[in-house]
Amino acid sequence: RQQWELQGDRRCQSQLERANLRPCEQHLMQKIQRDEDSYGRDPYSPSQDPYSPSQDPDRRDPYSPSPYDRRGAGSSQHQERCCNELNEFENNQRCMCEALQQIMENQSDRLQGRQQEQQFKRELRNLPQQCGLRAPQRCDLEVESGGRDRY
């Protein structure tokens, strides 16, 4: 993978080295396995509507209260820990993308078949939203892609 030729690369690399993204991987794997057990949830009908007017006239403001309550009893420990780790990347969208790419890479060998890989990507793209964080745009989650650091 090409190294970024920008200031802040080292800061991001050290952030990535410090971060423990394993809870994110565990949370996502649990989620897709749960979804498979329940005959496949319709991805177009999520339990949390990010567009609901109570949050923002058009879209939820990224810094408004999170739809995922970190104190919520129903939230998994893995998700809570995952969100705490991802929160460290909130002010660096490029680095947030790197973290998500790392999660994808780490789990790619464990995903069985194209359907499970697609489902994992779908949940991974939703992860920032679940944590009440801004999501990086132009972030390539394709593991096999060569020119990935186009973010």
């Epitope: 058009d58 403001d61 890989e117 939203q129 745009q137 989650l141």
Partner: antibody, heavy 121, light 107 residues
Framework: EVKVVESGGGLVQPGGSLRLSCAAS????????MSWIRQAPGKGLEWVAN????????YYVDSVKGRFTISRDNPKKTVYLQMNSLRVEDTAVYYC??????????????WGLGTMVTVSS | SYVLTQSHSVSVAPGQTARITCGGE??????VHWYQQKPGQAPLLVVS???GRRSVTPDRFSGSNSGDTATLIISRVEAGDEADYYC??????????FGSGTKVTVL
Amino acid sequence: EVKVVESGGGLVQPGGSLRLSCAASEFTFTYYWMSWIRQAPGKGLEWVANVNGDATEKYYVDSVKGRFTISRDNPKKTVYLQMNSLRVEDTAVYYCARVGTTVVNDGFDLWGLGTMVTVSS
Amino acid sequence: SYVLTQSHSVSVAPGQTARITCGGENIGGKGVHWYQQKPGQAPLLVVSSDTGRRSVTPDRFSGSNSGDTATLIISRVEAGDEADYYCQVWDPTSEYVFGSGTKVTVL
């Protein structure tokens, strides 16, 4: 009201220049990537260019590279598209659109009404 | 470059179900966004594969995304659903890609 409003379209000769503006209101402008998308008469949608929140990253469709420049003025909450060396095939309605922020590679969640650019001799 | 293929037109009787397909290589691994555009109006984001319907979108609109095909489903079609519908994804080789659009005609 959360909205974006385009202006600056008009009739221009081939080889000429035009600058489009997109004024945003009622949302935290700096959070969002902003894009220009065009639609030739009777045709489909084509993404043209986009810029990130602090204007450090800009991307263009191949057909406009070197001719069009996207920029933004955050205090004025405005995005611009400077179009030089215009060609007949650039004739289209140009829409300003906001890229969402909640999901990775989100969609264009807010669109303006568009401004018509006609390139003709 | 990444290409999205949409059928040119779909005709459906009121009250019936319209299915609009969008084909692309391994599209199930991408976030797919669907836009409705009525004549003389700007496009409107109605549904996304990751986040579902927008609050302004009737619950008659839904969809699926798996394998090489994404589908927008409009159930109990009404006259007001007549419009052009575009799918869109982001791809690292082609940036923001739109399908060619599908014209939905309510008979």
